[in-house]
């Protein structure tokens, strides 16, 4: 008996071939001997089966001795043994129809779980293997689960169902909803304008939800809300904003915030959350602000940084085009009685200067 695997919703073509290359009488029946379709001369006739409106054949092939049964919009319950009667012979074809669906919406938040459920005919014992867009393989039986979805899991998942050494392939498009970056850091000199951007890693037709930015300033004992906003069809509208600092928010995506001035009291870490309509859970992006200040008070030249810096960062004070006068892995450095000239305060790591502030020291007479 020949085995054919089909996909729910698809069309399948079961073949039946006569030895004579001409149009002769044929019938297709199911395992209950109920006629599905056949021919009377050059006319297609249909029987009383449940497939009536979804069954068809290809008349153009009859003259060649081919009498296929075409079943459209396959259902799991179409799984059966189909018998083609032609020339006093019976050809049996076992059709097994499978369906693979995501348990919920195919748009899932980063960190959520994806469950794929296989619908299969009674008596079958298929195995399933799915490959994610980033090449991760998962296998199982009736259900497959992937926990902690990552941004790289967005795209087409290819799943192969294996039964009776035959296979059928399903493709499921999954969209992982997330920000492009989980975390970012901005380095600014005191007084400079600060731009925070929160680009999303996905595009959808309509995007509706609400969000909030909580800020934990390094100098503050607790965090506070800086801004709340709504998102309607990709349009951003501010609901509430703190008066200190005077934040401004862009009206279009990507989400964009402007802090008019970087000040030491604002240095710290923020957490932007975005709740999307009809989704449980929230998207998160951490943002960090490091602020540098260089000052001269009487005979003391000081450079300070505030904010979440790595303990490996080096803070240096140097006279332009000269060796550093002082370099420390600390958040403040100073030089007493500095020479006149242009001094540079540098915040650097192993690979680059991250932040630089210049201060002019005038000669003392």
């Amino acid at each position: 008996k020949k085995v054919v695997l089909g996909k729910k919703g698809d069309t399948v073509e079961l073949t039946c071939t006569a030895s004579q290359k001409k149009s002769i009488q044929f019938h297709w029946k199911n395992s209950n001997q109920i006629k599905i379709l056949g021919n009377q001369g050059s006319f297609l006739t249909k029987g009383p089966s449940k497939l009536n409106d979804r069954a068809d054949s290809r008349r153009s092939l009859w003259d060649q001795g081919n009498f296929p049964l075409i079943i459209k919009n396959l259902k799991i319950e179409d799984s059966d043994t189909y018998i083609c009667e032609v020339e006093d012979q019976k050809e049996e074809v076992q059709l097994l129809v499978f369906g693979l669906t995501a348990n919920s919406d195919t748009h899932l938040l980063q960190g959520q779980s994806l469950t794929l459920t296989l619908e299969s005919p009674p008596g079958s014992s298929p195995s399933v293997q799915c490959r994610s867009p980033r090449g991760k393989n998962i296998q199982g039986g009736k259900t497959l689960s992937v926990s902690q979805l990552e941004l790289q899991d967005s795209g087409t998942w290819t799943c192969t169902v294996l039964q009776n050494q035959k296979k059928v392939e399903f493709k499921i498009d999954i969209v992982v909803l997330a920000f492009q970056k989980a975390s970012s850091i901005v380095y600014k000199k005191e007084g400079e304008q600060v731009e925070f951007s929160f680009p999303l890693a996905f595009t959808v037709e309509k995007l509706t939800g609400s969000g909030e930015l909580w800020w934990q300033a390094e100098r503050a004992s607790s965090s506070k809300s800086w801004i709340t906003f709504d998102l309607k069809n990709k349009e951003v509208s501010v609901k509430w904003v703190t008066q200190d600092p005077k934040l401004q928010m862009g009206k279009k995506l990507p989400l964009h915030l402007t802090l008019p001035q970087a000040l030491p009291q604002y240095a710290g870490s923020g957490n932007l959350t975005l709740a999307l309509e009809a989704k449980t859970g929230k998207l998160h992006q951490e943002v960090n602000l490091v602020v540098m200040r260089a000052t001269q008070l009487q005979k003391n030249l000081t450079c300070e940084v505030w904010g979440p810096t790595s303990p490996k960062l080096m803070l240096s004070l140097k006279l332009e085009n000269k060796e550093a006068k002082v370099s420390k892995r600390e958040k403040a450095v100073w030089v007493l009685n500095p020479e006149a000239g242009m001094w540079q305060c540098l915040l650097s790591d192993s690979g680059q200067v991250l932040l630089e502030s210049n201060i002019k020291v005038l000669p003392t007479w």
Partner: antibody, heavy 122, light 107 residues
């Protein structure tokens, strides 16, 4: 392509000196911190030293502090490790590796040489 | 110096198994931790940086998690080429320190 090639290893007596070199190619050498990491026979990896992109800052493992000096010549795209007062426990494969620094926040060693073997024995 | 304690020191597993290796720092290191794979006669290979970021070109069967003092490397389904020694490295502060290593062997 990005490549690091170590040289200068060999057999040396305890108390003597040796200088290792690491030739870098395929990337802007002067924009990266560079490390030396070693593995003694039958032991695990041990971090040895780092030098910053401009050569101004250097840090060492306690086990080599005062005996080893890391340096670089950005014009020659070369990293060095001067090893003085060598001991039997310095016997190891020495790797040079590049450090990527992202936003002053994330760090990782993404490119490694194949290593050069140093044997300290009398 | 920050001490890194890695466990187990060795581990026997079969192809297809899920394996977990842990690393504990003697003090908080935020997410300043990387995982490296070492095979005999080869250069070490970066797998995970910043505790959970997968290095480009590394199979997605590898994943990292944790923050602060406790970190985990998970291999979801072992492949024959995954049998090697794995090391954690704290790169939060100088001097950098490696864990003692975990040798992953075929059962």
């Amino acid at each position: 392509q990005v490549q690091l090639v170590e040289s200068g290893g060999g057999v040396v007596q305890p108390g003597r000196s040796l200088r290792l070199s690491c030739a870098a190619s395929g990337f802007t050498f002067s924009s990266y911190g560079m490390h030396w990491v070693r593995q003694a026979p039958g032991k695990g990896l041990e971090w040895v030293a780092i030098i910053w992109y401009d050569g101004n800052n250097k840090y060492y493992a306690d086990s080599v502090k005062g005996r080893f000096t890391i340096s670089r010549d950005n014009s020659k795209n070369t990293l060095y490790l001067q090893m003085n007062s060598l001991r039997a426990e310095d016997t190891a494969v020495y790797y040079c590796t590049r450090e990527v620094a992202l936003e002053g926040y994330y760090y990782y060693m993404d490119v490694w040489g194949k290593g050069t073997t140093v044997t300290v024995s009398s | 110096a920050i001490q890194m304690t890695q466990s187990p020191s060795s581990l026997s597993a079969s192809v297809g198994d899920r394996v977990t290796i842990t690393c504990r720092a003697s003090q908080g290191i935020r997410n300043g931790l990387g995982w490296y794979q070492l095979k005999p006669g080869k250069a070490p290979k970066l797998l995970i940086y910043a505790a959970s970021s997968l290095q480009s070109g590394v199979p997605s069967s590898f994943s990292g998690s944790g923050s602060g003092t406790d970190f985990t490397l998970t291999i979801s389904s072992l492949q024959p080429e995954d049998f090697a020694t794995y090391y954690c490295l704290q790169d939060y502060n100088y001097p950098y320190t490696f864990g003692q290593g975990t040798k992953l062997e075929i059962k």
